[in-house]
């Protein structure tokens, strides 16, 4: 089934955007001017969750990339990734679970929950030039609050 | 305050064309999704299509071809171009904002255009 | 297309009375329905989103209810200023965004 998809870019509420840092890997940090062009277009997507009065699931892909945000255990750690995926079959209405995230949206803020893993985020450091990482914290030092801006063609 | 102002609707021809436009104040066209739904007289909601960024639009499947939704983001101002009108598409225009991106629900209006359709 | 069915279609009540409304989408959208009241020469105003939630402002009075393909919309006191029309919105479909046909609430 077709799916409702829109291209935005997101900085963190520190104003950080996010930046590939290698093939898979985003990092954020502070960008001005013609560096702004760096910043990561995401392709998201509305998919089908779990049932939920204030969560909307949501799968976050590169933009003209065959790359899907993702979370997984590594060493028995809920870990964010960036993960292949074949073009031909991406996006779909039902994403395999490590693709879905539950959108949660106060006050113009936006965070996005792993449904995978329940209770982690997609976080950014206070530091500059740090991993975009899978955090199971919120409200501490890690940055969970992320604001979208649309992207014009 | 969140605020929509729907301008353009008149009287139409049978295959002419109309544009509308809805200007809006108290929130950002970068970060909210707008839809167009219209109301003939007498009848029921019906809904047109929805704009998120310029390159993702999304229609009912009665409104592709003649319908195309845009914006301008820069002027705070949606669009909506309606070609090859028939009477039945006399009816008055409202926009309205997604109240969450992808939640579908529409938690802003406006007060409406009217378009009439005849010769 | 998810095509959304109100019943009833007119509704006469009186102040006072619980009103009951429903709403029948033709495949299972989960709990993306909303409910929106329009009065004539107005523009519609959102009552509830994702079948239960009310929306900012709105009366407790009304509440909403539902999973899969059936929904409600319950007022459970009828005051003068809920006469109007009423309207269920499949809001999570595929990529249509589809209306019930109405259901016009008058006084008995």
């Known amino acids: 089934a077709p799916v409702r998809s829109l291209n935005c870019t997101l900085r963190d509420s520190q104003q950080k955007s996010l930046v590939m840092s290698g093939p898979y890997e985003l990092k954020a940090l502070h960008l001005q001017g013609q560096d702004m062009e760096q910043q990561v277009v995401f392709s998201m997507s509305f998919v089908q969750g779990e049932e939920s009065n204030d969560k909307i699931p949501v799968a976050l892909g590169l933009k003209e990339k065959n790359l899907y945000l993702s979370c997984v255990l590594k060493d028995d750690k809920p870990t964010l990734q960036l993960e292949s995926v074949d073009p031909k079959n991406y996006p779909k209405k039902k994403m395999e679970k490590r693709f879905v995230f539950n959108k949660i949206e106060i006050n113009n803020k936006l965070e996005f929950e792993s449904a995978q893993f329940p209770n982690w985020y997609i976080s950014t450091s206070q530091a500059e030039n740090m991993p975009v990482f899978l955090g199971g914290t919120k409200g501490g030092q890690d940055i969970t609050d992320f604001t979208m801006q649309f992207v014009s063609s | 305050e969140v605020q929509l102002v729907e301008s353009g609707g008149g009287l139409v021809q049978p295959g002419g064309s109309l544009r509308l436009s809805c200007t809006v104040s108290?929130?950002?066209?970068?970060?909210?999704?707008m839809s167009w739904v219209r109301q003939a007289p007498g009848k029921g909601l019906e809904w047109i299509g929805i704009?998120?960024?310029?390159?993702?639009?999304y229609y009912a499947s009665w409104a592709k071809g003649r319908f195309t939704i845009s914006k301008d983001t820069s002027k705070n101002t949606l669009y909506l171009q309606m070609n090859s009108l028939r009477a039945e598409d006399t009816a008055v225009y409202f926009c309205?904002?997604?109240?969450?991106?992808?939640?579908?629900?529409?938690?802003?209006w406006g007060q409406g255009t009217t378009v009439t359709v005849s010769s | 297309e998810i095509v959304m069915t109100q019943s009833p279609s007119t509704l006469s009540a009186s102040v006072g009375d619980r009103v009951i409304i429903t709403c029948q989408a033709s495949q299972s959208i989960d709990n993306w329905l909303s409910w929106y009241q329009q009065k004539p020469g107005k523009a519609p105003k959102l009552l509830i989103y994702?079948?239960?939630t009310l929306a900012s402002g709105v009366p407790s009075r009304f509440s909403g209810s539902g999973s899969g393909a059936e929904f409600t919309l319950t007022i459970s006191s009828l005051q003068p200023d809920d006469f109007a029309t009423y309207y269920c919105?499949?809001?999570?479909?595929?990529?249509?965004?589809?209306f019930g046909q109405g259901t016009k609430l008058t006084v008995l």
């Open positions: 309205a904002r997604e109240r969450q991106i992808f939640s579908g629900d529409m938690d802003g």
């Open positions: 704009i998120y960024d310029s390159a993702s639009t």
């Open positions: 108290g929130f950002s066209l970068s970060s909210y999704a």
């Open positions: 994702r079948a239960s």
């Open positions: 919105q499949n809001t999570g479909g595929g990529v249509s965004i589809a």
